[in-house]
């Protein structure tokens, strides 16, 4: 599976989609986890609702919000107020049981804001425009991607 | 109709290889996992492992990890398993099943809803 | 591997009777298991998926129960088509695993 490179701004907000098989991964719920070192386990940042078709609605832990859209195959995280310690290599998964299918890997890069190192003067940017999707340097090819679950079915808690 | 054809039985000699197959129709074969499973004379149901055709996606047993092979053709819509070296104790059914999915309350769930008339492979030397 | 033991391994019993069988995981496995009836040469046929969703076409005398590790499947009235053999299977955890099977004979 190759990374994902996406980088955000300092400060602002920003979005990560993951595409993956709807209907292989049927039941399942999604996670979002943070890679500790390169061959270290990857932490639980957060989770997907406990109840499979309530997956849309948002769940948050700290700053970081998870939505997974089950029917299109679409999970979307978002790292608001992006800080310098939220860079990192990450991974979004798919749970079944007591196992995590790894459906992304992603790795977080935090761009600095020019702004904070000169006088802004009367500069301002509207508050719709703080959501920042992100610099996709390098795209991977994330799993097969027809509107296409085994069948371990996941709805409610993780495995 | 939705169904799953296997393949006709088989006979064969220890150490000689064997593949059978298992034909979906009337359903997106693509779309659905797709399970074998072993029944040995007058034992139980034993799972052997699953493969998802649409990105060749495999789940073995343990137990059958090594000792068979499973695979999938999505342009004919058709499962396999084979061996390559066949032993005596592989004499037994084996069964295609098509995982269906299910929403029961709020959940995502699976079943094995529609399944092959099964094959009988015999090995004796 | 998650181990599902069935109980009994063989039952007797007349038409009409209640009948329960019962399944034992492990280690909690949710709501994700399903119930199947063998006739002998033949192949297995789905009766219940999530525990105690009856599959379409399947008699309402045969209903599922419980969640975690241990479920139920009663057939409240017996009728002699359903004289077979019966079997779990927990589709929670990779591998999936089958019960040893409960065999239901005509007493």
């Known amino acids: 599976l190759n990374t994902t490179v996406l980088q955000g701004m300092a400060g602002q907000s920003l979005r990560v989609s993951c595409t993956y098989d709807a209907l292989k991964h049927w039941g399942r719920r999604k996670a979002w986890c943070r890679q500790l070192g390169e061959e270290g386990p990857c932490q639980r940042v957060v989770s997907t609702h406990g109840v499979w078709l309530l997956a849309f609605l948002k769940k948050r832990n700290g700053s970081t919000v998870i939505a997974d859209d089950t029917l299109a195959g679409t999970v979307t995280i978002t790292l608001k107020n992006l800080q310098a310690g939220d860079a990192g290599l990450y991974q979004c998964q798919s749970l079944r049981g007591r196992e995590a299918e790894v459906l992304q890997k992603v790795l977080v890069e935090v761009l600095e804001d020019p702004l904070d190192d000169q006088d802004a003067g009367d500069l301002w940017v509207p508050e719709e425009s703080s959501s920042f999707e992100g610099a996709q340097v390098e795209h991977s090819t994330s799993r097969n991607q027809e509107t296409s679950f085994p069948p371990t079915s996941h709805h409610h808690h993780h495995h | 109709e939705v169904q799953l054809v296997q393949s006709g039985a088989e006979v064969k000699k220890p150490g000689e290889s064997l593949k059978i197959s298992c034909k979906g129709s009337?359903?997106?074969?693509?779309?659905?996992?797709i399970g074998w499973v072993r029944q040995m004379p007058g034992k139980g149901l034993e799972w052997m492992g699953i493969i998802y055709p649409g990105d060749q996606d495999i789940r073995y047993s343990p137990s059958f990890q090594g000792q068979v092979t499973i695979s999938a053709d999505k342009s004919i819509s058709t499962a396999y398993l084979q061996w390559s070296s066949l032993k005596a104790s592989d004499t037994a059914m084996y069964y295609c099943?098509?995982?269906?999915?299910?929403?029961?309350?709020?959940?995502?769930?699976?079943?094995?809803?529609?399944w092959g008339q099964g094959t009988t492979v015999t090995v004796s030397s | 591997d998650i181990q599902m033991t069935q109980s009994p391994s063989s039952l007797s019993a007349s038409v009409g009777d209640r009948v329960t069988i019962t399944c034992r995981a492990s280690?909690?496995?949710?709501?994700?298991l399903g119930w199947y009836q063998q006739k002998p040469g033949k192949a297995p046929k789905l009766l219940i998926y999530?525990?105690?969703s009856l599959q379409s076409g399947v008699p309402s005398r045969f209903s599922g129960s419980g969640s975690g590790t241990d479920f139920t499947l009663t057939i409240s009235s017996l009728q002699p088509e359903d004289f077979a053999t019966y079997y779990c299977l927990q589709n929670y955890n990779y591998p999936h695993t089958f019960g040893q099977g409960t065999k239901l004979e005509i007493k």
């Open positions: 999530a525990a105690s």
């Open positions: 099943a098509r995982y269906g999915r299910y929403i029961y309350g709020y959940g995502g769930y699976h079943g094995m809803d529609v």
């Open positions: 009337g359903f997106s074969f693509n779309t659905y996992w």
């Open positions: 280690q909690a496995i949710r709501d994700d």
